[in-house]
């Protein structure tokens, strides 16, 4: 029978600024029941706190609600492991709120194949922000991105749309079901998951000349650059 | 409607002992810090001690400390504080107050009145 | 400890003037600090925190200033039901320290 071993905090997420949850992984448990708590202070404060609420984020964690998150304020926080035999504790971790941001799905997620007869066919991807994020005040840019790919392929396809909430896409296969997909990010954070699946057929007339394809960004109301991993990079929080 | 009431004030002999309590409802009471805020009579405010959500860190002023414990109970949405060797100048009224998540006393009780008086 | 000190302990003015309450602290605080209203007879109400932001329900003629040390509450234009003792006080570090106060009065 020993201590337990040293908690880690490994992960705090926001979804919208407005609260957040850290995770901790318990050290060993030395063979004994052991208790976790959560203290934190704020940058500038020595007065210690304990974890408001140690049940919404699930086992090993601490949620803040609303009343609790300040922006502009950076967390100091560490969890003590205590049993029969002693304590130990995590490293304190810094948490600003401000970059621990990782955004539900976009939601409505709307995908039609257009076929104007003067003007090339392309695929209209639209969705909305998702809803705990308030853009108007101004906090928040978010990004986003789509992927797409035949039913039967492996690879995806990504296009980076900017803060775009709708883009167009020429070059598909005819005859395939594709499955699009999007995700979002605010400028300092993480992505959020891809949202649902949804599914277009693409009619097998579906075709463009090499001339049509050639076509400006201005023309498209939307940027049709295909991005490869590495040039997502930048735009990527790891 | 989100509430704090006190008791258990009254007059006591010098030296003598005393349980405030603070009942609170209409909030997660276990999800506040709480605190005792005291006020001499004709004179301005004072804060004396607070505890945390569950009870793990104290602390208190130095006028009082040796002498009152607070403690909580959360599963009686209650809060105390116990005086014991009470002085002349420990005669107040005693306010319990919650501690909002940005740490200000956003919630406060309607107060009990403690005299220390032979 | 660090000792906060407010000026003036009183004072008196007129219906629709500006009045403005000084709170020093001895040591740099940052921005936390709050101010209380105190009306004869009542439970102190918390006005202003992190030094400028208004509680809801605090009507737009309060208003704080200042960070680290020096610290205002100004009301813009005293009304009636204004008067009331009004307490800063820091929250940074216990002790969570009052200012003596200031009692404002209607001429």
């Known amino acids: 029978q020993l201590p337990p071993g040293k908690p880690e905090i490994f992960k705090c997420r926001s979804p919208n600024k407005e609260t957040f949850t850290c995770w901790w992984r318990p050290g060993t448990d030395g063979g004994l029941p052991t208790n976790y708590s959560l203290t934190y202070h704020r940058e500038g404060e020595t007065l210690m706190h304990e974890c408001p609420d140690y049940i919404t984020g699930g086992p090993n964690s601490c949620h803040f609600g609303k009343q609790y998150t300040s922006m502009w304020r950076t967390y100091i926080m560490m969890v003590n492991a205590t049993n029969q035999m002693g304590s130990s504790f995590s490293d304190e971790l810094y948490v600003d709120v401000t970059y621990i941001v990782q955004p539900d799905p976009p939601l409505e997620l709307a995908v039609e194949v257009k076929q104007p007869e003067d003007r090339k066919p392309y695929l209209w991807i639209k969705w909305s922000p998702p809803t705990l994020i308030d853009l108007k005040t101004g906090w928040f840019t978010l990004l986003y991105e789509i992927r797409l790919k035949p039913e039967k392929a492996a690879e995806w396809e990504i296009h980076f749309a900017g803060q775009q909430t709708e883009f167009k896409i020429l070059s598909l296969h005819p005859g395939q079901k594709y499955l699009v997909q999007v995700r979002c990010k605010p400028d300092h954070g993480y992505w959020s998951a891809w949202s649902p699946a949804t599914f277009i057929q693409i009619p097998s007339d579906f075709t463009m000349n090499d001339e049509q394809k050639l076509i400006s960004e201005e023309d498209l109301g939307g940027e049709q650059k295909l991005i490869s991993e590495e040039d997502l990079h930048h735009h990527h929080h790891h | 409607e989100v509430q704090l009431v006190e008791s258990g004030g009254g007059l006591v002999q010098p030296g003598g002992s005393l349980r405030l309590s603070c009942a609170a409802s209409?909030?997660?009471?276990?999800?506040?810090?709480m605190n005792w805020v005291r006020q001499a009579p004709g004179k301005g405010l004072e804060w004396i001690s607070y505890i945390s959500s569950r009870g793990g860190t104290i602390y208190y002023a130095d006028s009082i400390k040796g002498r009152f414990t607070i403690y909580r109970d959360n599963a009686r949405n209650s809060l105390y504080l116990q005086m014991n060797s009470l002085r002349a100048e420990d005669t107040a009224i005693y306010y319990c107050?919650?501690?909002?998540?940005?740490?200000?006393?956003?919630?406060w009780g309607q107060g009990t009145m403690v005299t220390v008086s032979s | 400890d660090i000792q906060m000190t407010q000026s003036p302990s009183s004072l008196s003015a007129s219906v629709g003037d500006r009045v403005t309450i000084t709170c020093r602290a001895s040591q740099g605080i940052s921005n936390y600090l709050a101010w209380y209203q105190q009306k004869p007879g009542k439970v102190p109400k918390l006005l202003i925190y992190?030094?400028?932001t208004l509680q809801s329900g605090v009507p737009s003629r309060f208003s704080g200033g200042g960070s680290g040390t020096d610290f205002t509450l100004t009301i813009s234009s005293l009304q009636p039901e204004d008067v009331a003792t009004y307490y800063c006080?820091?929250?940074?570090?216990?002790?969570?320290?009052f200012g003596g106060g200031t009692k404002v009065e209607i001429k």
């Open positions: 107050a919650r501690l909002s998540g940005v740490d200000i006393f956003d919630i």
């Open positions: 992190f030094a400028s």
């Open positions: 209409g909030f997660t009471f276990s999800s506040y810090e």
């Open positions: 006080q820091r929250y940074n570090s216990a002790p969570l320290t």
